[in-house]
């Protein structure tokens, strides 16, 4: 059980106040983290509170400003990047968001040696992506879907690609679906370790169907936004990978890296690229039917000036029970011999664990094992491997950092974080300097987040980087809800849940219950993290009990739970929320006439299906930007879990799992449907179709749209959204305003 310290003493009780909705909307109780921008084994950069860029040397204890806030302000810079040779800094301004990760910006290059901006051969604007080479100060950038190279910031650019075209050919940047569902980055180019080669992806979207929606803006006529967006079963982007020698880019030009034969035989994806050395690269490919992944290690042939990918260096990863990998196929972390690597994939018992691959995947040596999962490999050095897992005390929603000594035999394992601040910190991530000389630990909770700096050899804490003292003080007179994380055992399924309880919770009383659900494949909602958010307010001020439940399809508890939803989305996720609600009612403190469910995105889909389940459990519910039919969502995501919407594959379940098919069942619930009209991700089409089905079934419901808002419903829309949802729930639960 994770109980937040209530800090309520009788004498103080009258000075304590509940959270308000205003607190939440103003971000009054938001926390800070500190991620060092490592530039060597013992140095990092950090942007100070007054916006100076400061270089810290851990070993000398010295720090100095490398770039003043005055210089930053002179171009309205919101971000920066130091060249590895420390001669130049790029300054980023005019940030303009595109999709989840992508944005365009204006870039200025500042010469640290003379304290002036580089003049002559300035960068064009706006730039879609820009980065320094890993060594020296070469620049690669993407402008109007083409890649350019500069040997030095003041040099004229060398144009690498010429076929880039808006919405047609993307070079060095992903198209919509690769950005959102495969790469999870704004870039698709990768420098080799010493900057000799530059690898990049080319995405051809010529044949992809386009989603078009109106952007109303302020003009007389709305604009139409067109995005090549492959929905389930549609034509996909065609991807090719090229590598160019950046020392002599004009000599042989870009060389294409071959796709493995077993991948090239049908539709496929490129999933990631990892440089091993300057002359060895590792590419990962995935069949369109995403249960087969191939990792291909390719070598530069000096005599041929091309990349050779022998069959002996192809490693196949196949899932027979679901899709390959977790949310994504994991990426390899290469060891110092530059051919063997460490990788997370399912072991024979169906738990994701670290394996060491020396020759073939079949002969992989399992490094971690148990009924828990390894989650991320942070760093491999000559003698240590650092990773995170949820092993400690068998709580799937925790993250601790471990070190395995790979230099000794047998390897020994040490939990670096388990006992550091045991009550406060149970969910960590880490950031390592070169050669893991030092590292930062960032603790996200369940207590107030704290970031600390550590010695990479001894694990000794060197200093606190950020401890959120102001937040701690601000919370001293706030009646925070209590939180507990427990599990239910139902029919051989373990359902972990987090319950958020009103500050003066009394088990003998009855409380309204709100289920907050996401429930998407490979997600996890029940996590030991700190948050003061809307549901904290609902518990603190409005006296609701809020519960989050991780059912079938969720992550980090083994493949049996994860792959249970394979090819049948919308069934078990809903069942498990319902099962949990019934168990909560049995606990005796839930008013069974006042139960609601809400969710966003995938959670909106699950909440809609739960409301339409015909159980009579839910009085009301909210769906924000829900998927309503898997035929409307992106191919890469949807097909991973559902296969293809064709007769000979899984069309029947695509049809059976829509929200529209259950329109009649909304008759006895209060339903609030919300969507942004400019949602590039889950298209407004989804909610439009739900609304149409409800109207056709003559079922009353409430709805709210947010004009020109995307999937995030940000800015003023956020305030309106949470205010509107609060009114809806209070009305549903008969709570006075």
């Amino acid at each position: 059980i994770v109980l937040r310290p209530s800090r309520v003493h009788n004498s103080e009780e009258n000075t304590m106040r509940a959270l308000t909705l205003k607190d939440i909307l103003n971000g009054t109780f938001s926390y800070k983290t500190f991620f060092p921008n490592w530039i060597s084994g013992q140095e990092y950069l950090h942007q100070s509170a007054d916006n100076n860029i400061v270089l810290y040397n851990i070993e000398t204890g010295q720090s100095y400003t490398i770039l003043s806030n005055r210089t930053m302000k002179s171009v309205n810079a919101s971000n920066y990047g130091l060249s590895p040779d420390r001669q130049f800094v790029y300054l980023e301004s005019d940030y303009s968001k595109l999709w989840r990760y992508s944005y365009t910006a204006t870039y200025y290059i500042y010469d640290l040696s003379n304290g002036e901006f580089v003049r002559g051969n300035e960068l064009p604007r706006p730039i879609q992506y820009l980065c320094w080479s890993p060594v020296g100060s070469k620049l690669a950038y993407v402008y109007q879907n083409n890649i350019y190279l500069k040997q030095r910031p003041g040099d004229p650019p060398f144009q690498i690609t010429f076929n880039g075209r808006e919405n047609k050919i993307f070079n060095g940047i992903p198209d919509w679906v690769y950005e959102e569902e495969m790469l999870a980055t704004k870039y698709a180019l990768w420098w080799s370790p010493n900057g000799k080669f530059l690898a990049y992806a080319e995405f051809n979207d010529t044949d992809i169907p386009v989603i078009a929606y109106s952007y109303y803006g302020d003009e007389q006529y709305p604009r139409t936004i067109n995005i090549p967006y492959p929905k389930a079963g549609a034509k996909n982007p065609v991807v090719r990978i090229f590598i160019i020698d950046t020392t002599y880019p004009a000599y042989v030009g870009p060389q294409e890296v071959p796709v493995p034969a077993m991948i090239a035989s049908s539709d496929y994806y490129f999933s990631w690229l990892t440089w091993v050395t300057d002359e060895r690269v590792c590419l990962q490919w995935l069949k369109r039917v995403q249960n087969v992944s191939v990792l291909s290690i390719c070598d530069f042939r000096e005599d041929w000036q091309t990349w050779d990918c022998p069959k002996t260096q192809e490693h196949i990863e196949e899932s027979r029970t679901g899709w390959a990998g977790g949310f994504f196929v994991s990426t390899p972390v290469f060891s110092y011999d530059a051919i063997s690597y460490y990788k997370i994939f399912s072991d024979k018992d169906g738990y994701k664990h670290i394996h060491y691959i020396k020759d073939t995947v079949e002969n992989a040596i399992q490094i971690t094992s148990g009924k828990w999962e390894a989650i991320n490999i942070f760093r491999v050095t000559q003698d240590s491997l650092f990773y995170s897992s949820n092993e400690f005390e068998e709580y799937p929603g925790r993250r601790n950092i471990y070190r395995i000594s790979i230099g000794s035999y047998p390897p020994s394992k040490k939990c670096v974080t388990c006992h550091l601040r045991k009550e406060r910190c149970q969910y960590y991530t880490a950031s390592f300097s070169d050669y893991a000389k030092y590292y930062a630990l960032v603790c996200y909770g369940p207590g107030i987040p704290i970031s600390t700096l550590h010695d990479g050899r001894t694990d000794q804490e060197i200093k606190i980087l950020e401890e959120n003292k102001e937040l701690e003080n601000a919370l001293k007179n706030i009646q925070l809800p209590k939180e507990e994380i427990k599990k239910l055992e139902v029919d051989e399924i373990t359902l972990w849940y987090k319950m958020i309880l009103p500050p003066q919770f009394d088990r003998s009383k009855k409380y309204p219950l709100l289920i907050q659900v996401y429930g998407g494949p490979c997600s996890q909602s029940v996590r030991s993290v700190f948050a003061v958010n809307w549901i904290s307010y609902l518990a603190s001020k409005e006296g609701m009990v809020i519960a989050l439940v991780d059912g079938r399809g969720t992550a980090f508890q083994g493949d049996k739970l994860l792959y249970a939803v394979y090819r049948k989305l919308g069934v078990y996720e809903v069942e498990d929320q319902i099962t949990a609600v019934r168990k909560f009612i049995e606990m005796g403190f839930i008013d069974e006439k006042r139960i609601a469910i809400w969710g966003w995105s995938y959670g909106g889909y699950v909440s809609s299906l739960a409301l339409a389940s015909g159980t009579g459990l839910f009085k009301c519910g909210i769906a924000v930007a829900p998927v309503s039919s898997w035929e409307y969502y992106a191919s890469v995501y949807t097909e991973r879990f559902m296969g293809l919407p064709t007769k000979d594959d899984n069309l029947e379940h695509y049809k059976n799992s829509t929200v529209m098919a259950r329109a009649e069942y909304f008759r006895n619930v209060d339903y609030l449907l919300i969507h942004g009209t400019a949602d590039d991700n889950v298209h407004f089409q989804n909610s439009a179709q739900i609304a149409k089905a409800l109207v056709n079934a003559q079922v009353d419901f409430q709805a709210m749209w947010y004009s020109d808002q995307n999937h995030g419903l940000s800015g003023l829309s956020t305030n309106h959204l949470y205010t509107h949802m609060t009114h809806f729930l209070k009305q549903c639960f008969s709570l006075s305003d």
Epitope: P258, S265, P310, K311
Partner: antibody, heavy 119, light 109 residues
């Protein structure tokens, strides 16, 4: 020493079936990609089918797709080619061949077995 | 599929002479080309792989060259046992279908 010995050839009528076998020795059979290549009387070489050692992926020439099936039994160090719906144009000497481990050229060949399809 | 065209169809030469055989690909195959020798009643034998590398036990009078679409097999001094049919084969990216050229017959003049 690497050895590949084909068997199972013979005379059949159009539409009938035949299974060719290839007994392999002198190398770790399960690790290598294998293939069948045929040669019609007086003609050149034609690649027919291939199978991966790891992963077991199978590949076919368009002319035999849907009629021929390549398979392997690693415990017996044997490669097979199941040929259904045979046609007169399938008449040829069928060679079993071992691919190089790095790339798909044929390092070692069997002596071949003759398949005659005639009414 | 990639088509390989060998020329000439037949090459009539005397022992001791130099033989130059050509293989042209319909599209670039990089360096992924092999040469085989086949004598009557025998199985083919690998001579050259990766366009220019000699296979094990192949005498150094056999050499291969070329890349992309144009390849050459050269026999510097023909020995009596070299009179046979020679085939080229592409294995570009190891993608099926693997294809062979139509063959060049080297016969005694």
């Amino acid at each position: 020493d690497v050895q590949l010995v084909e068997s199972g050839g013979g005379v059949v009528r159009p539409g009938e079936s035949l299974t060719l076998s290839c007994a392999a020795s002198g190398f770790t059979f399960s690790s290598y990609d294998m293939g069948w290549v045929r040669q019609a009387p007086g003609e050149g070489l034609e690649w027919v089918s291939g199978i991966r050692g790891r992963g077991g992926s199978t590949y076919y020439a368009e002319s035999v797709k849907g009629r021929f099936t390549i398979s392997r039994e690693s415990s017996k160090n044997t490669l097979y080619l199941q040929m259904n719906s045979l046609r007169a144009e399938d008449t040829a000497v069928y060679y079993c061949a071992k691919e190089n481990e790095r790339h798909s050229f044929f390092e070692y060949w069997g002596l071949g077995t003759l398949v005659t399809v005639s009414s | 599929e990639i088509v390989l065209t060998q020329s000439p169809g037949t090459l009539s030469l005397s022992p001791g002479e130099r033989a130059t055989l050509s293989c042209r690909a319909s599209q670039s195959v990089g360096h992924y080309l092999a040469w085989y020798q086949q004598k009557p009643g025998q199985a083919p034998r690998l001579l050259i792989y990766d366009a220019s590398n000699r296979a094990i036990d192949i005498p150094d009078r056999f050499s291969g060259s070329g890349s992309g679409t144009e390849f050459t097999l050269t026999i510097s001094r023909l020995e009596p046992e070299d009179f046979a049919v020679y085939y080229c084969q592409q294995y570009y990216n190891d993608w099926p279908p693997l294809t062979f050229g139509g063959g060049t017959k080297v016969e005694i003049k």
